[in-house]
Each structure stands twice: as structure tokens, then as C-alpha cells.
């Protein structure tokens, strides 16, 4: 399994070096996440071929997953601080169900699948001590949660490889938003 | 690692124009984050613009509405379109590459970069 952020061997080799501040966490957590991903698109990509669908043909999907949009205020025009924190909160917790689908979806990175799980529970956990306005933060109705859970793991073989697919490509692209971001506050 | 190759610098008058490129080798460049950088004489080397995988933009305040970033991924290169050039922009400008997708306005968050590329622009 991944080693989680901080302990790696560089960081083994280095006892005395400066702790990282709450910014640098989250930024090495974000990278150890992306890390992550990395590993379970290279397994979905040699199993199917969804890796070479175009992007136009991957949007006829009826996925609702997160998306930064310009009213988010993660984008350098009409950027806001405080408003792009609880987007990307937000978004985290709406990715949580999808997360939770992708753990029966690995036969080789069972493992990672779980650790890119864990390691977002762990991010959102930092990301909430750095946010000023916890109450703007939605968080999502279990019981649709469930049911979306159960109507995704419902579908045939081609429908969840797609599904799958588009998960991770959507979360990769949410968290590189979310860092670019996160890296002018 | 992915090596980069800038080109397209030279000397031009304020009020004109220049495009840089930066063509990259060995790696995915689609998938990498892709910056420039200058250095002027006697000071620190300093952000100008990024683009990330998906394509999002950011611009240092001062080269807003003047430059633009661009990228072609069938050919690995990013492009610098410099418009309304000022003696203050003559640098070296560099080009850096961040294999995370992300970018940023920090040297750190890069992991190759160019040989650099000057731009002399003269009043």
C-alpha cells in the first residue's frame, strides 16, 4: 500500500527539518491523492478502453459529480477566498459516495482504492480546520447517498467501467482546480 | 522527467509583440501543468503565467490583459503571447513543467524546466 504524506523515506532520512505548516499538509496530501489516482486510472485504463473515449462522448453521462464552475470563486477571475474553501469542501463530501463505489472496483489496487478514500476523509478533516464558514458547507443526505450507491453498483459491467472512468478523471480534475487554488490563499 | 526547449525570444521595440514557445520531450505532456518564469538583470526569477491540464489560466497582475498562455497538446508545446511590451518586461523568460497537472506561482511546484529564452524589449 502507498506510504501516507510525511512518511516517506525522505521524510525518515530528514528527523530535524522544519514541521510543515497547515498549508504544506494539505498541499502533500492533495499530491499524495493524485498519487493515488494515478495508480487506479492506470489499472482501469489497460482493462477497458474508456481511457481513449473522447471527452465529448464521456459527457453523456448522468453522473451529477462536482465541478468547479467560475461562480465558485476557485478561478483566478473572481476569485474569493472563502467561498472556494467551501466549494471545494463541498465538493469533497459530494465525491464521498463516488469514492465509496470505486472500492469494489480494483482487483489489483484494492489497496490504493482504499487509501485514496481514506487520505480524502483526512484532507476534508484538514481543510474544515482551515475554513472560517463551516456552516455554508453542505454536507450530503445519507439516505440519497445510499440509494445512488446501490443504483451505480446496479448497472451492467460496460455502464461501471464507464462510471468508474469518469469518477476518477472528474476527481483528479476537481482536486488540481482545488490545489491551483488552495496555493494562492 | 520531461526536457523543455524554449524559443521565439529576441529584441523588440515597447508597443510590440513576441511569442514564445516551449516544446516538450519524454513524457505526457497533456497531463502536466505548464508555466512561464522570467528573470530580469539582478533579480529574482518570478511568476508570469500558468495553465493547467484542464486548461485553467492564471496571470501575474503584471502582464494581465497583455500576455496570453496557450497550449497545444498534439504538438507538446506552450505558447507566450506577449503583446504591449515594455522595457520592464525584458527577462529571460523560462519555461517549467508540473507533472501533478496543478502549476502555481512558486518555483517549487515544478519539477523540469527550460534553458530559458531572453526578451529584450527597448524604449
Known amino acids: 500500500a502507498p506510504v501516507p504524506p510525511g512518511e516517506d523515506s525522505k521524510d525518515v532520512a530528514a528527523p530535524h527539518r522544519q514541521p510543515l505548516t497547515s498549508s504544506e499538509r494539505i498541499d502533500k496530501q492533495i499530491r499524495y491523492i493524485l498519487d493515488g489516482i494515478s495508480a487506479l486510472r492506470k489499472e482501469t485504463c489497460n482493462k477497458s478502453n474508456m481511457c481513449e473515449s473522447s471527452k465529448e462522448a464521456l459527457a453523456e453521462n448522468n453522473l451529477n459529480l462536482p465541478k468547479m464552475a467560475e461562480k465558485d470563486g476557485c478561478f483566478q477571475s473572481g476569485f474569493n477566498e472563502e467561498t472556494c474553501l467551501v466549494k471545494i469542501i463541498t465538493g469533497l463530501l459530494e465525491f464521498e459516495v463516488y469514492l465509496e463505489y470505486l472500492q469494489n472496483r480494483f482487483e489489483s489496487s484494492e489497496e490504493q482504492a482504499r487509501a485514496v478514500q481514506m487520505s480524502t476523509k483526512v484532507l476534508i478533516q484538514f481543510l474544515q480546520k482551515k475554513a472560517k464558514n463551516l456552516d455554508a458547507i453542505t454536507t450530503p443526505d445519507p439516505t440519497t447517498n445510499a440509494s445512488l450507491l446501490t443504483k451505480l453498483q446496479a448497472q451492467n459491467q460496460w455502464l461501471q467501467d464507464m462510471t468508474t472512468h469518469l469518477i476518477l478523471r472528474s476527481f483528479k480534475e476537481f482536486l488540481q482546480s482545488s490545489l491551483r487554488a488552495l496555493r494562492q490563499m | 522527467e520531461v526536457q523543455l526547449v524554449e524559443s521565439g525570444g529576441g529584441l523588440v521595440q515597447a508597443g510590440g509583440s513576441l511569442r514564445l514557445s516551449c516544446t516538450a520531450s519524454g513524457g505526457t505532456f497533456s497531463e502536466y501543468a505548464m508555466a512561464w518564469f522570467r528573470q530580469a538583470p539582478g533579480k529574482e526569477r518570478e511568476f508570469v503565467t500558468d495553465?493547467?491540464?484542464?486548461?485553467?489560466?492564471w496571470y501575474a497582475d503584471s502582464v494581465k490583459g497583455r500576455f496570453t498562455i496557450s497550449r497545444d497538446n498534439a504538438k507538446n508545446t506552450v505558447y507566450l503571447q506577449m503583446n504591449s511590451l515594455r522595457p520592464e518586461d525584458t527577462a529571460v523568460y523560462y519555461c517549467?513543467?508540473?507533472?501533478?497537472?496543478?502549476?502555481?506561482?512558486?518555483?517549487?511546484?515544478?519539477?523540469?524546466w527550460g534553458q530559458g529564452t531572453q526578451v529584450t524589449v527597448s524604449s
Open positions: 517549467a513543467a508540473d507533472s501533478y497537472g496543478v502549476g502555481g506561482g512558486a518555483e517549487r511546484y515544478y519539477d523540469s
Open positions: 495553465i493547467g491540464e484542464s486548461g485553467g489560466t
